[in-house]
């Protein structure tokens, strides 16, 4: 069980991240799918090594004063939901804005149904150009 | 099926980085091979998660204005290579330079004889001290 | 086997991070363990890819001229520590410091009773908020 | 020290809407799921809606459901509760709570506002 989804610019207001099968994108089969556009929905109970990358171009001026933020963010049934993980870079002083990457990674145990999603302070700061920004997992 | 190679220093003025079998290194069997210095490439079709680790030294007068940009990239037989992975990293206005680190990582299916390999922008602001620069993957 | 912790902030004075379980940690079984609240130690030789993440916050003009540097490192039994990986990120002109995040993380070979840990230029400067710095490993 | 801070309650007539803000600090907010729970006059505590950390996830009692929305600006620290369509029996104090740490299955509160009064009186 295996996913590897592409990033997606999206016009709607929200924090979390869009994403699509697209490119070179990885869905090993049924038990794992993404939902809405925005989350990794898995079927069966297990470890799973969970990922994410974010690309983003901001800069100090133009940004408020808190660092740039991704989530890496669970939803299990019945729940809500929870932060796994997080990293933060404080904005560039390059201009218009300064690129930088950020890897987020762990291993987790999901239960069936259990959803994960990537959050970040403001999306419309994300890079979508190839190979920038993806998201994925693996069961162990 | 595993492997996980070290950085080398190159004098060759290619921007696809150098690896080498040296240090604590990884070379599970003979399905994953260095291949020329700079490629690892299998044998065997299937998912893997595909790893790398570039740290560089740059400073933003001595630098283009682009960033420092590390690709993870796949050439499957017959086709050309295309570009799985991207992590871009603004310069640093630190003298004579600042280090950086980036780290890139995905799942994707490879084909038997495809080989994936790491390109930068520019390989001389590449940091090769211990551990500071590798490159692997492992078969799911 | 597999093992993810969490970070927790310490008085010790060694530059040795400290994690616990807590919050949504990760304990496979008794093949792993968390060993003084330092290191993983695992009982089955055998292929492991071992990560690390810690995000730090730090000044440049409150900071040592030496870049912050997170190392991932093995002590084998009856040798000294190595280290496997290393990253490397500059000091933020950002005040009163600003955030960064490091990912390592890599394929490696341990022996039985092997122990990896994480070792940093400045403890004091880690991130120790919900999501933000963490240590795990997957046996392959 | 933590501190939680509601406001725009008031009179208002049925079937009229009203938005109630909590104002949050000490705490990080975005990490922390939030409720709102009320008090009728004579009444025992009533969970009214309740959100997840970063507001993907929200669950509202049967008695609201439809006319009532949550919401949190992670940015501002700021929860809110869009109360339409309101009946006399929604009459009561509002209080907003903090999620007592954010791994808990069950929702458990550690903070509470000091209220704001809903009237819905003609």
């Known amino acids: 069980i295996a996913a590897h989804v592409i990033s997606e610019a999206s016009s709607k207001t929200t924090s979390v991240l869009q994403w699509a099968e697209k490119g070179y994108y990885t869905m090993s089969n049924n038990l794992v799918t993404l939902e809405n556009g925005k989350q990794l929905t898995v079927k069966r109970q297990g470890l799973y090594y969970i990922y994410a990358q974010v690309t983003f171009c901001s800069n100090r001026e133009a940004s408020s004063q808190a660092p740039f933020i991704a989530s890496l963010c669970l939803k299990s049934p019945g729940r809500f939901e929870r932060i796994l993980l997080r990293a933060a870079n404080t904005h560039s002083s390059a201009k218009p804005c300064g690129q930088q990457s950020i890897h987020l990674g762990g291993v987790f145990e999901l239960q069936p149904g259990a959803s994960v999603f990537v959050n970040v302070t403001d999306p419309s700061q994300v890079s979508h150009g190839t190979g920038f920004t993806s998201f994925g997992l693996l069961k162990l | 099926i595993a492997a996980h190679v070290i950085s080398e220093a190159s004098s060759k003025t290619t921007s696809v980085l150098q690896w080498a079998e040296k240090g604590y290194y990884t070379m599970s069997n003979n399905l994953v091979t260095l291949e020329n210095g700079k490629q690892l490439t299998v044998k065997r079709q299937g998912l893997y998660y595909i790893y790398a680790q570039v740290t560089f030294c740059s400073n933003r007068e001595a630098s283009s204005q682009a960033p420092f940009i590390a690709s993870l990239c796949l050439k499957s037989p017959g086709r050309f290579e295309r570009i799985l992975l991207r992590a871009a990293n603004t310069h640093s206005s630190a003298k004579p330079c600042g280090q950086q680190s980036i780290h890139l990582g995905g799942v994707f299916e490879l084909q038997p004889g495809a080989s994936v390999f790491v390109n930068v922008t520019d390989p001389s602001q590449v940091s090769h001290g211990t551990g500071f620069t590798s490159f692997g993957l492992l078969k799911l | 086997i597999a093992a993810h912790v969490i970070s927790e902030a310490s008085s010790k004075t060694t530059s040795v991070l400290q994690w616990a379980e807590k919050g949504y940690y990760t304990m496979s079984n008794n093949l792993v363990t968390l060993e003084n609240g330092k290191q993983l130690t695992v009982k089955r030789q055998g292929l492991y890819y071992i990560y690390a993440q810690v995000t730090f916050c730090s000044n440049r003009e409150a900071s040592s001229q030496a870049p912050f540097i997170a190392s991932l490192c093995l002590k084998s039994p009856g040798r000294f520590e190595r280290i496997l990986l290393r990253a490397a990120n500059t000091h933020s002109s950002a005040k009163p410091c600003g955030q960064q995040s490091i990912h390592l993380g890599g394929v490696f070979e341990l022996q039985p009773g092997a122990s990896v840990f994480v070792n940093v230029t400045d403890p004091s400067q880690v991130s120790h908020g919900t999501g933000f710095t963490s240590f795990g490993l997957l046996k392959l | 020290e933590v501190q939680l801070l509601e406001s725009g309650g008031g009179l208002v007539q049925p079937g009229g809407s009203l938005r109630l803000s909590c104002a949050a600090s000490?705490?990080?907010?975005?990490?922390?799921?939030m409720a709102w729970v009320r008090q009728a006059p004579g009444k025992g505590l009533e969970w009214v809606s309740g959100?997840?950390?970063?507001?993907?996830?929200?669950y509202y009692a049967d008695s609201v459901k439809g006319r009532f929305t949550i919401s949190r600006d992670n940015s501002k620290n700021t929860l809110y509760l869009q109360m339409n369509s309101l009946r006399a029996e929604d009459t009561a104090v509002y209080y907003c709570?903090?999620?007592?740490?954010?791994?808990?299955?069950?929702?458990?509160?550690?903070?509470w506002g000091q209220g704001t009064l809903v009237t819905v009186s003609s």
């Open positions: 959100i997840g950390a970063v507001g993907e996830t929200t």
């Open positions: 709570a903090k999620e007592a740490n954010n791994l808990s299955d069950n929702l458990v509160f550690d903070y």
């Open positions: 000490g705490f990080t907010f975005e990490l922390y799921a």
